[in-house]
């Protein structure tokens, strides 16, 4: 009697036991991932974050879309709407060099780096090549005209214009358009200024930066957060708080992130600080990740969303800050008119979009997202989506220009920059951080459940036996 | 090195004509176009014509429209000032001056013209 | 047409005194704005552009301000070369215009 009752009390002790030890795992194991965590995600060398932050092991591809214009002369000569046409992708890989004059600080716990510019053509990932010719707006024209706004000045540039046989549009290759072309009306401009003109002149040979971001050292809360750019807090591009460079660069984040947070990120491509909201759970090969975006709400109104009222700097194209969906970033670009906004003109007012015809917004294609896996906060797949257009207004003076009865935000390009984890790092990501915790994970669940019935049933066994050797 | 020469000023009787040249070195005259500016005796100055860059339109100050005209050789990078029907208050020193925005950062030396009978 | 008007029309003052000739633009013409100093007898000399940008080669004392209808040209501390005439021209519309000129004499 007392051996069976014996070894019935030892298999609930066990049970409890074992019980308990999955409890106790419970905590000690998330406390053990979180210190192996936060020990692996601060930017100092040695650590997982580090070297995957100096050079991204994942391929990034920047597509473009051109905007063909297909009815150049009726927009300047009857100021039409301007009839668009997109042309692409037009692929390149981008962001493949590894930071540069990286330099930790220990007294403030930041690390300073610049980040190279860099693009390849990727012809089998594309439509056509980089010779591809397209009739697009004039940017030299629309952005002299809006730089020097001077009745006398615009005479002189109607005579360089005129001489130079330029027009409110041009035809230029893919090449030229995107990374600069020698302007034949700028050429004419007896001062020393930069007659080559592109979307994105200069790039190649380029870097963004100088950034400064905390390294988690003291915090890792605070890891990856900017501390500075360009050795300042703040932009000189906007007023009050829209000034701030808040948050991280969005290729990672502080690890542990809830989906109620609004993750707040600075691009430099778009002049300001902007934030993504939580929209869904998404399982990114094997690994479970929560899908970021960035909400209609950040490209509102001020009448819309007050908290937008200083990204409105003017009151004429915006019509008194009631335009949404556009942003003016001519501040940033040298007084040039470019205005930023989502592919198609996505979330942007009608009166933007009503003098273009031939685009199709589509939430699905057209918006940013990023797909974040919440413990480690690294960014494991993103799609960043934007439109760069320009301003040209009618002009009485320039020739070219004076026959537009209204103003044209004019679509130039839109781009879609794109990274996913490869299949080998995934797998990497998986064996390491995903599936480790899982693993902690089952054998706690293990643990205690075996325990908790091995206790149950050998109680009741033991209680059982007990009834019977008294009756 | 910049010059801005002017020449042809002199005396000449109401309603008669002159004309004005001046010879740009150091620069094309059709790259930045030209001013005449005068300034009549103990007075301020007074813009009074342009031809813009590259023979482009030209422009004149009210008080001589119809009267005056500015033309540019390129050739002999040399501006000119054809003044007719001219009258007393058209008397002042007469100068040429270079400018692209539209201030004058180089100028003649300025030739006298005198109207009278 | 643009009025530009300019005051004092003269003013006397001493070497090393601070000088503030005033114009102003009978409608806004934002920045565009030069200032000329004339000797007798002489071509005048830009000394500022756009209202607020020294020439070169013009000494540091000179300098500008304004924007919109009201400017200034300053001279910090007066050189014996600085007596002359100074005028303001707007050069945002044509026709261009000069002020009436103020001139600067050793008290």
């Known amino acids: 009697g007392c051996d069976r009752n014996c070894g019935l009390i030892t298999g609930a002790v066990i049970g409890a036991v074992l019980a308990v030890f999955g409890g106790i795992l419970m905590p000690v194991g998330d406390m053990l991932i979180q210190k192996t965590i936060k020990k692996e995600v601060v930017l100092e060398e040695g650590t997982i974050a580090f070297k995957n932050w100096v050079k991204t092991g994942t391929e990034i591809y920047r597509q473009f879309w051109i905007f063909d214009v297909q009815n150049p002369q009726e927009v300047m000569m009857n100021s039409s709407n301007i009839q668009v046409k997109q042309r692409g992708p037009y692929t390149y890989r981008v962001r493949f060099l590894a930071k540069e004059n990286i330099t930790q600080d220990p007294k403030d716990n930041t690390v300073s780096f610049l980040q190279p510019n860099g693009a390849i053509f990727e012809p089998s990932l594309s439509v056509g090549t980089e010779a591809d010719n397209f009739t697009v707006l004039n940017l030299a024209v629309a952005a002299a005209s809006h730089i020097y706004p001077n009745p006398f000045v615009q005479v002189v540039l109607n005579s360089l214009i005129n001489k130079s046989k330029s027009s409110m549009f041009q035809v230029r290759t893919l090449r030229e358009l995107l990374w600069g072309y020698t302007d034949p009306f700028l050429s004419l401009v007896p001062y020393p200024v930069s007659t080559r003109v592109g979307m994105f002149y200069p790039y190649n040979n380029t870097a963004d930066g100088v950034y400064k971001v905390f390294n988690g050292k003291d915090s890792i809360s605070k890891v990856a957060i900017i501390d500075t750019y360009k050795g300042k807090r703040n932009l000189s591009y906007w007023e009050s708080y829209c000034d701030m460079i808040n948050g991280t660069d969005a290729a990672s984040f502080p690890p542990f992130v809830e989906k109620s947070q609004v993750l707040q990120f600075f691009s430099s491509d778009i002049c300001r600080s902007i934030y993504a909201v939580f929209e869904s759970d998404v399982n990114l090969k094997g690994i479970p990740v929560y899908r970021f975006v960035l909400p209609s709400k950040a490209f509102a109104s001020p009448v819309q969303n007050p908290d937008n009222h200083c990204f409105c700097t003017e009151k004429i194209i915006s019509k008194n800050c009631t335009s949404y969906g556009v942003l003016d970033i001519s501040k940033c670009k040298e007084g040039k008119p470019v205005y930023i906004s989502l592919p198609h003109f996505l979330y942007a007012s009608p009166d933007v979009s009503e003098t273009i015809d031939g685009l199709n917004p589509n939430e699905e294609e057209h918006r940013t997202y990023l797909d974040i896996e919440p413990i480690t906060g690294f960014t494991l797949q993103f799609a960043k989506r934007l439109q760069v257009n320009l301003l040209v207004k009618p002009s009485n003076k320039i020739q070219v220009l004076k026959r537009l009865k209204r103003n044209y935000i004019v679509p130039i390009l839109w781009l879609n920059e794109t990274g996913t984890i490869g299949d080998e790092k995934a797998k990497m990501f998986r064996s390491q951080v995903t599936g480790k915790i899982n693993l902690l994970g089952l054998i706690e669940m293990i643990l205690l459940s075996v325990g908790v019935v091995m206790f149950v049933a050998f109680m009741i066994s033991y209680c059982a036996c007990r009834s019977k050797t008294i009756k | 090195e910049v010059q801005l020469v002017e020449s042809g000023g002199g005396l000449v009787q109401p309603g008669g004509s002159l004309r004005l040249s001046c010879a740009a070195s150091?620069?094309?005259?059709?790259?930045?176009?030209i001013h005449w500016v005068r300034q009549a005796p103990g007075k301020g100055l007074e813009w009074v014509a342009w031809?813009?860059?590259?023979?482009?339109?030209?422009y004149y100050a009210d008080s001589v429209k119809g009267r005056f005209t500015i033309s540019a050789d390129t050739s002999k990078n040399t501006a000119y000032l054809q003044m007719n029907s001219l009258r007393a208050e058209d008397t002042a020193v007469y100068y040429c001056?270079?400018?692209?925005?539209?201030?004058?950062?180089?100028w003649g030396q300025g030739t006298l013209v005198t109207v009278s009978s | 047409d643009i009025q530009m008007t300019q005051s004092p029309s003269s003013l006397s003052a001493s070497v090393g005194d601070r000088v503030t000739i005033t114009c102003r633009a009978s409608q806004d013409v934002s920045n565009w704005v030069a200032w000329y100093q004339q000797k007798p007898g002489k071509a005048p000399k830009l000394l500022i552009s756009y209202a607020t940008s020294l020439y070169s080669g013009v000494p540091s004392r000179f300098s500008g301000s304004g924007s919109g209808t009201d400017f200034t040209l300053t001279i910090s501390s007066l050189q014996p070369e600085d007596f002359a005439t100074y005028y303001c021209q707007q050069h945002s519309n044509a026709p261009l215009t000069f002020g009436q000129g103020t001139k600067v004499e050793i008290k």
């Open positions: 150091g620069f094309t005259i059709s790259s930045f176009g």
């Open positions: 001056a270079r400018s692209f925005f539209g201030y004058f950062d180089y």
């Open positions: 031809i813009a860059p590259y023979g482009g339109e030209t």
